[in-house]
Interface confidence: low
Amino acid sequence: EVQLVESGGGLVQPGGSLRLSCAASGFTFNNYAMNWVRQAPGKGLDWVSTISGSGGTTNYADSVKGRFIISRDSSKHTLYLQMNSLRAEDTAVYYCAKDSNWGNFDLWGRGTLVTVSSASTKGPSVFPLAPSSKSTSGGTAALGCLVKDYFPEPVTVSWNSGALTSGVHTFPAVLQSSGLYSLSSVVTVPSSSLGTQTYICNVNHKPSNTKVDKKVEPKSC
Amino acid sequence: DIVMTQSPDSLAVSLGERATINCKSSQSVLYRSNNRNFLGWYQQKPGQPPNLLIYWASTRESGVPDRFSGSGSGTDFTLTISSLQAEDVAVYYCQQYYTTPYTFGQGTKLEIKRTVAAPSVFIFPPSDEQLKSGTASVVCLLNNFYPREAKVQWKVDNALQSGNSQESVTEQDSKDSTYSLSSTLTLSKADYEKHKVYACEVTHQGLSSPVTKSFNRGEC
């Protein structure tokens, strides 16, 4: 399968260093120039660096010149980005992208998030949003999980280990005044299922190695 | 550096209708020697990496549906979607690859224009677990509405709240083209326990009058 898989992102303090990797498969790696492109949260695409197929030539955006080093290992089919003297404004999802050898990018990885902050990693607290008469409308009930006070992004939320996807809305995280993130994930289900069906939200915060499975049930009075 | 400017910043088009996005470069990206424009178009769906749609300004990448087409030359370019589908909800970027630094436009957010749908409104009290931690979050959910503009006001014992809530909105749903919104009112446990009635009032184009959902603290 033709694909690019980035790794190495995470939380780093201002002034610190991080090395990103991008494993390529399914094409002749040495024949193509490769690029790093980044995307700050909620912003557009920003080209970072390119390296020729042989690795002999590199180019950098002015914003990273002298701080970032792009390289490649043809034997490992891997692209690297060594990031030094990191700044808060380097916070972004970093994508690895294959060059068509004409300068457009015909294959992209899924990206790896780099967060540059002096804050510490913190795992979330997960609280149930319990269904009740106040969260029922015309035979449909809503329930959810509040994933609160974590850092850095991201967290992933699934329901019933991925078996429940219909009617699920996981909201974008908001940055609270405390500097910690919070998000909600909700699902609408038939009211009639509340007594019979089990609903569990599965929360994973990789930066803190936190995994929580929270059962959400009607509040017993 | 070559500056790429897209217009409009956002665009709402009905299903089956034509969508047009423009891109202007600060200098020509046409090589007259081979009459090729070094310009590409990318589609980025929510939570996904970008995907190449068009290169050489008008050549479709393999696997891209033929409803996508590119045109233009020199400094002015257009991406056209001839018959918009629900799955085309995305941000679209143009990119010049005439020279490094390669530069992208700021992006154009394309949404589906559909009929008005009023939100279903739900309210959730804080859990006992959370109250034990000393904080109370009250959540108001607005589900599956269109258009995106909605107003949520929190009232505590009928007193309007400000500065203590945060909202988050989903991207447009790729199936029914609606939005959902969560608004979270955050209080200390001590403040929460001083009051009885918690209400969120929702105003939306699809509602003939505001809808209020409320609960009394301590009651089921």
Epitope: S52, W102 | Y31, N34, Y98, T99
Partner: nanobody, 121 residues
Framework: QVQLQESGGGLVQPGGSLRLSCAAS????????MSWFRQAPGKEREFVAV????????FYADSVQGRFTVSRDDAKNTVYLQMNSLKPEDTAVYYC??????????????WGQGTQVTVSS
């Protein structure tokens, strides 16, 4: 896969002319500088000429300035080296190469196999 294929070499008398061609495939050359190098027996490979991007001109080694002319036809994805007033010391294998970046980096990812030019009476 980028490939460069030289042609046009051969045996020519001193004072004569030859036109070398280098056809590129796998990459559109219009964005890239295209260069000619040569390597005489027992010597290091040396720079001869570069055709920069269209409109950006060409540069030559001192030893060939005024005698050799480099040109490019981006529509045909081909670069040429017109060699006039040839001398015995021009005898070498001539290689073309494509610059590895759109800027004029002087670093080359891809080379042709070479074509032999022999200047002799």
């Amino acid at each position: 896969q980028v490939q460069l294929q030289e042609s046009g070499g051969g045996l020519v008398q001193p004072g004569g002319s030859l036109r070398l061609s280098c056809a590129a495939s796998g990459r559109t050359i219009s964005r890239y500088a295209m260069s000619w190098f040569r390597q005489a027996p027992g010597k290091e490979r040396e720079f001869v000429a570069v055709a920069r991007r269209s409109g950006d001109g060409a540069f030559y080694a001192d030893s060939v300035q005024g005698r050799f002319t480099v040109s490019r036809d981006d529509a045909k994805n081909t670069v040429y080296l017109q060699m006039n007033s040839l001398k015995p010391e021009d005898t070498a294998v001539y290689y073309c190469a494509i610059d590895s970046d759109t800027f004029y980096s002087g670093s080359y990812d891809y080379w042709g196999q070479g074509t032999q030019v022999t200047v002799s009476s």
